[in-house]
Amino acid sequence: FSPLRRISIKILVHSLFSMLIMCTILTNCIFMTMNNPPDWTKNVEYTFTGIYTFESLVKILARGFCVGEFTFLRDPWNWLDFVVIVFAYLTEFVNLGNVSALRTFRVLRALKTISVIPGLKTIVGALIQSVKKLSDVMILTVFCLSVFALIGLQLFMGNLKHKCFRNSLENNETLESIMNTLESEEDFRKYFYYLEGSKDALLCGFSTDSGQCPEGYTCVKIGRNPDYGYTSFDTFSWAFLALFRLMTQDYWENLYQQTLRAAGKTYMIFFVVVIFLGSFYLINLILAVVAMAYEEQNQ
């Protein structure tokens, strides 16, 4: 080994070196939280970049760059260090127009703490292992969601566009001409029935067990879907999102009530099956796999 490499190895294995890097990262994180940093922080930024560069150079000199089994770039944790340094120099010396987008990558510096703190490294390792093991469960989950999204698509496509429209058409009015003139929420409220405090027109359906319109209103399919158009089963992707919402139980009771009002109470069977299979079974299966992966990593 050359004297330079010997010195690099000595520095690399020294505990003070690890402490220096850890303190640098933590101080860097504190500086990144500043709202309006003063001008002198620019010099501090250069110092941090210098320390990170020095750390990487020490590692490269001690272990080699990329040829060989234990070299710098063969360790995935060093990829992060390398990216941090590359972006530090890119944002500083290369004029790339929208630099603010590249500055976002400075946040990656905080992730360097993972590679420095041994306990944290183990936990993250376990997390990555669990993700690898989750692939089969994820495939099963996506498959199940896709199947139910297709069923939902067939059962409820367009149903959430059903609204209670006022009965009388004046002069030469048509639904189409009215819809073309509607602009503000107030305009909508003139023609459609809204429950007090509701931001969407009252949903209704054409079957006997679905929601009915009050006196003087007719159920029509027109306009956009509820929740600014985000809640629907009109395309596979929207249906998939709705199913994901059911699986994660994210305000699912609202989706359930909206759909049952528009389609009919019979369709509660669909929701019972999805909640039992998606929410109770699949979610717990995912948790079980994660728990197993952690157990294996600990052993």
């Epitope: 566009k161 429209f165 189409e176 399919k221």
Partner: nanobody, 120 residues
Framework: EVQLVESGGGLAQPGGSLRLSCAAS????????MAWYRRAPGKQRELVAS??????ISYTDSVKGRFTISRDGSKRWSLQMNSLTPEDTAVYYC???????????????WGQGTLVTVSS
């Protein structure tokens, strides 16, 4: 294209009766509302009666108890007019809010209008 065809208009005596019929031709997936409107000379068009698929029926105050709207099938409906008065003289239009197919939004369709004259 969906078309509404009316029949049954004409001349009637005061106190007499007439029956108007309307049929929807062409592709019809779902009729949301069937209605009859009328336009009296020099007046605006007004809703006379309407019926929904779930059986909800409404009438304008001036015809309650005299006129009866009914569904004669999935694509046909009629207006039975009894105890006619000269004020009932108008062009009667058949109207439907319907979806031509399952993917379409509800659209408005009008008949060409049929003249009802009540005169002695």
């Amino acid at each position: 294209e969906v078309q509404l065809v009316e029949s049954g208009g004409g001349l009637a005596q005061p106190g007499g009766s007439l029956r108007l019929s309307c049929a929807a031709s062409g592709p019809v997936f779902n009729i949301n509302k069937m209605a009859w409107y009328r336009r009296a000379p020099g007046k605006q068009r007004e809703l006379v009666a309407s019926v929904t698929p779930t059986g909800s029926i409404s009438y304008t105050d001036s015809v309650k108890g005299r006129f009866t709207i009914s569904r004669d099938g999935s694509k046909r409906w009629s207006l039975q007019m009894n105890s006619l008065t000269p004020e009932d003289t108008a062009v009667y239009y058949c109207n439907a809010l319907l979806q031509p197919d399952s993917y379409s939004n509800t659209r408005t369709y009008w008949g060409q209008g049929t003249l009802v004259t009540v005169s002695s």
